[in-house]
Interface confidence: low
């Protein structure tokens, strides 16, 4: 069976949404009226991984492009990257590790850590107009908390 | 204001270095992608290379991978595009620009000459 | 490599006139699409980005459309000061790629 997906926007918990600085790299801004057309749309799909109650392993790609978030070490740190991928084989239910992200839903919010790092979390910085990244601490400085909203296919 | 100031140009045998700089002023450097395009003489525009706002992702056109190199300095607020084993048609006027991707390229510097002859 | 197509290659007008550019991308690229005006011997300066967005102190008769393949740009009321080459330029993957180029000259 088709691996089942939906499509998606993130905005942190300082309401800052995610829109393309480069062909391979988010960053997270606050945007308003028409400028919400630059945020990025995510396809989540729901795929093979530790499942519970609260934590739901998915992987996100950018809608109509081959480009997956995955998490990769570069000098010797656990980092987040958009990765191309063939499009004729993803998505697929059993993704590579890397691209596994085990969603954590928290009081109506979302954490999403890595599940090739466990403890990294997709993270946003309190500064305005930065890289999306992956990050060591939750409940510091970095934003770890998202909101999800719907976006019709 | 928000300027780009550029400097590095010059005659170059084929084969020859040059090393490009563009100076940022009037904005927060580091919060930013960079690019450098280049025109030929009386041609349109080609993109040439693009490194994102902390350095980590570089990208360059095919023409002059392994040739080219762009850094950037974000303490200096500086961008660097160091050009290596020069041909001819590498002869151009060579822009830095500012440019994320979802907001397009502005400002540019005011570009600077590189010929590549013998 | 995703290929901009521009059309015309150049045009003639007048001042007053209507002018429509259009740039056609060789697959799908969303929204990612720029417009530039370039004098001779200055930089290009950026005119719209994300398809429709005017930039910050651009005058408001040019105006960008489309998204997916197919973009425009509109010149209302062409000005003496508009006569210069007008570039798209696709940002939704590397290699960016530009138009070859519009040239608007005065008829």
């Known amino acids: 069976a088709p691996v089942r997906s939906l499509n998606c926007t993130l905005r942190d918990s300082q309401q800052k949404s995610l829109v393309m600085s480069g062909p391979y790299e988010l960053k997270a801004l606050h945007l308003q009226g028409q400028d919400m057309e630059q945020q990025v749309v995510f396809s989540m799909s729901f795929v093979q991984g530790e499942e519970s109650n609260d934590k739901i392993p998915v992987a996100l790609g950018l809608k109509e492009k081959n480009l997956y978030l995955s998490c990769v070490l570069k000098d010797d740190k656990p980092t987040l990257q958009l990765e191309s991928v063939d499009p004729k084989n993803y998505p697929k239910k059993k993704m590579e590790k890397r691209f596994v992200f085990n969603k954590i839903e928290i009081n109506n919010k979302l954490e999403f850590e890595s599940a090739q790092f466990p403890n990294w979390y997709i993270s946003t910085s309190q500064a305005e107009n930065m890289p999306v990244f992956l990050g060591g601490t939750k409940g510091g400085q970095d934003i770890t908390d998202f909101t999800m909203q719907f976006v019709s296919s | 204001q928000v300027q780009l100031v550029q400097s590095g140009g010059g005659l170059v045998r084929p084969g020859g270095s040059l090393r490009l700089s563009c100076a940022a002023s009037?904005?927060?450097?580091?919060?930013?992608?960079m690019n450098w395009v280049r025109q030929a003489p009386g041609k349109g525009l080609e993109w040439v290379s693009s490194?994102?706002?902390?350095?980590?992702?570089?990208y360059y056109t095919d023409s002059v991978k392994g040739r080219f190199t762009i850094s950037r300095d974000n303490a200096k607020k500086s961008l660097y595009l160091q050009m290596n084993s020069l041909r001819v048609d590498d002869t151009a006027v060579y822009y830095c620009?500012?440019?994320?991707?979802?907001?397009?390229?502005?400002?540019w510097g005011q570009g600077t000459m590189v010929t590549v002859s013998s | 490599e995703l290929v901009s197509t521009q059309s015309p290659s150049s045009l003639s007008a007048s001042v007053g006139d209507r002018v429509t550019i259009t740039c056609r991308a060789s697959?799908?690229?969303?929204?990612?699409l720029n417009w530039y005006q370039q004098k001779p011997g200055k930089a290009p300066k950026l005119l719209i980005y994300?398809?429709?967005r005017l930039e910050s102190g651009v005058p408001s008769r040019f105006s960008g459309s489309g998204s997916g393949t197919d973009f425009t740009l509109t010149i209302n009321s062409l000005q003496p000061e508009d006569f210069a080459t007008y570039y798209c330029?696709?940002?939704?993957?590397?290699?960016?790629?530009f138009g070859q180029g519009t040239r608007v000259e005065i008829k």
């Open positions: 620009a500012r440019g994320d991707y979802d907001t397009g390229m502005e400002p």
């Open positions: 009037g904005l927060i450097f580091s919060n930013y992608s």
């Open positions: 490194i994102s706002s902390a350095g980590s992702y570089k």
């Open positions: 697959q799908s690229i969303s929204r990612y």
């Open positions: 994300g398809a429709s």
């Open positions: 330029q696709q940002s939704y993957s590397t290699p960016l790629t």
